[in-house]
């Protein structure tokens, strides 16, 4: 697994322990919490990152209206169960035997139940809407410049194939980034949109997962983009199953 050979670190995941004990003395990095080997040439899965985090001390309107089935991650942090590939297991349970089903980005998509709860498959999140509100600037951003800068960011920093950035919408001061990736579209080696969105979220919150700097400060044609708030909506290939009680 590619890691910085000289000082044996993982450029794409600071929440790792690395040592030159791979084949031929190569640098190998393992995720904190799970101890799973990670590929440092790409993004680490969100499931392994959450596990590591828990183990660490401490006009016509161009904006998209999230669908009624869109999920927001209101449950926050938990210590997830990951499969051997580092993906979320469909069923997650806590220490008190409360269980629930999650989607491929680890967001709860059913009511909570007990150990008898069945989650037949891991439902894929195929559409992610990242909703940002920026602080006042010297003037509105040029839409095409903003579009180009955000596409460049997802391509270069998060290694996400450009075809998965479906659209960038802008209606000052709201920016929306749409990521779309169906099961059939995702080839081996492609970064998952859920992982890219998670890295982006952590960057915006000043908690970069990359080695080095603490956060991400965006500029569009030199203009500082200071984010005021971020909301992320997740849409699954199969709508979530919540009781009417929760919906009211």
């Amino acid at each position: 697994h590619t890691a910085a050979q000289d000082n044996c670190t993982c450029p794409t995941n600071k929440m790792t322990v690395c040592s030159p004990d791979g084949p031929g003395g190569r640098c190998q990095c393992r995720a904190l919490g799970s101890g799973m080997a990670v590929d440092c040439s790409t993004l680490t899965s969100k499931c392994l990152l959450l596990k590591a985090r828990m183990s660490a001390p401490k006009n016509a309107r161009t904006l998209v209206r999230p669908s009624e089935h869109a999920l927001v991650d209101n449950d926050g942090l938990y210590d997830p169960d990951c499969d051997p590939e580092g993906r979320f297991k469909a069923r997650q349970c806590n220490q008190t035997s409360v269980c629930w089903c999650v989607n491929s980005v680890g967001v709860r998509r059913t009511d909570k139940g007990d150990l008898s709860l069945r989650c037949d498959e891991l439902v894929r999140t195929h559409h992610i809407l990242i909703d940002l509100r920026h602080r006042p600037t010297a003037g509105a951003f040029n839409h095409s410049d903003l579009d180009a800068e955000l596409r460049r960011l997802f391509r270069e920093r998060y290694r996400l194939h450009p075809k998965f950035v479906a659209a960038v919408h802008y209606e000052q001061p709201t920016i929306q980034i749409e990521l779309r990736q169906n099961t059939s579209q995702k080839a081996a080696g492609d970064v998952d949109i859920g992982d890219a969105a998670y890295y982006f979220e952590r960057d915006i919150k000043g908690e970069s997962l990359f080695q080095g700097r603490g956060g991400l400060d965006l500029r569009v044609r030199g203009e500082p983009l200071q984010v005021e708030r971020t909301l992320i909506y997740y849409l699954d290939e199969i709508p979530p199953k919540f009781s009417m009680k929760r919906l009211t």
């Epitope: 915006i204 919150k205 000043g206 603490g214 956060g215 030199g222 203009e223 200071q226």
Partner: antibody, heavy 119, light 106 residues
């Protein structure tokens, strides 16, 4: 190497205006905004505003709005800060600064221009 | 506006001492914090940005930590050239500075 060179010290009377220049070199002038920050004697640093040389857009600290005007001459790679209706409290060292290449912190600073307001 | 409160406003220390300066923001600034060193008659010099990232050429005795509203600058072993005034600055919502901490020779 990146350099910001400011104009010399000024002495002004209350009510007058002052215009300070900041010449940038060692990088593409239109790539970064230019901030203006001032420091009155014994006081903290105070952000006044910035100009984006790429499109002439400006953003000001509310405290100085109406009194400060930041402009630029792209052909001369120079930014200017003009402060009007001067009062004695405006006696300070005025700095121009350029952001860090990766963050919005201020990495490169001019040497400072002392503006004294006195009758 | 976000207010930045630095403490102490001044401190006396000897060469070799460990020095800690704290900075508290009036709201969460999500690690958008920089530390500057300023010597008399000179412009500020950027030491740390992103709360923890040391700038190129800055000695490793300087370190930054913290998150949310609370941040710290530590000088592990004070050197003669470190006697100066230190400022914190937030850049999460426009730009504001702390009032400064003057580090003097004991």
């Amino acid at each position: 190497q990146v350099q910001l060179v400011q104009s010399g010290a000024e002495v002004k009377k209350p009510g007058a205006s002052v215009k300070v220049s900041c010449k940038a070199s060692g990088y593409t002038f239109t790539t970064y905004v230019i901030h203006w920050v001032r420091q009155a004697p014994g006081q903290r640093l105070e952000w006044m505003g910035y100009i984006n040389p790429n499109n002439d857009g400006t953003k000001y600290n509310e405290k100085f709005k109406g009194r400060v005007t930041i402009t630029r001459d792209t052909s001369a790679s120079t930014a200017y800060m003009e402060l009007s209706s001067l009062r004695s409290e405006d006696t300070a060292v005025y700095y121009c600064a350029r952001p860090h290449f990766e963050t919005h912190a201020m990495d490169y600073w001019g040497q400072g221009t002392l503006v004294t307001v006195s009758s | 506006d976000i207010q930045m409160t630095q403490s102490p406003s001044s401190l006396s220390a000897s060469v070799g001492d460990r020095v800690t300066i704290t900075c508290k923001a009036s709201e969460d600034i999500f690690n958008r914090l920089a530390w500057y060193q300023q010597k008399p008659g000179k412009a500020p010099k950027l030491l740390i940005s992103g709360a923890t990232s040391l700038e190129t050429g800055v000695p490793s005795r300087f370190s930054g930590s913290g998150s949310g509203k609370d941040y710290t600058l530590t000088i592990s072993s004070l050197q003669p050239e470190d006697f100066a005034t230190y400022y914190c600055q937030q850049y999460w919502n426009t730009w504001t500075f702390g009032q400064g901490t003057k580090v003097e020779i004991k």
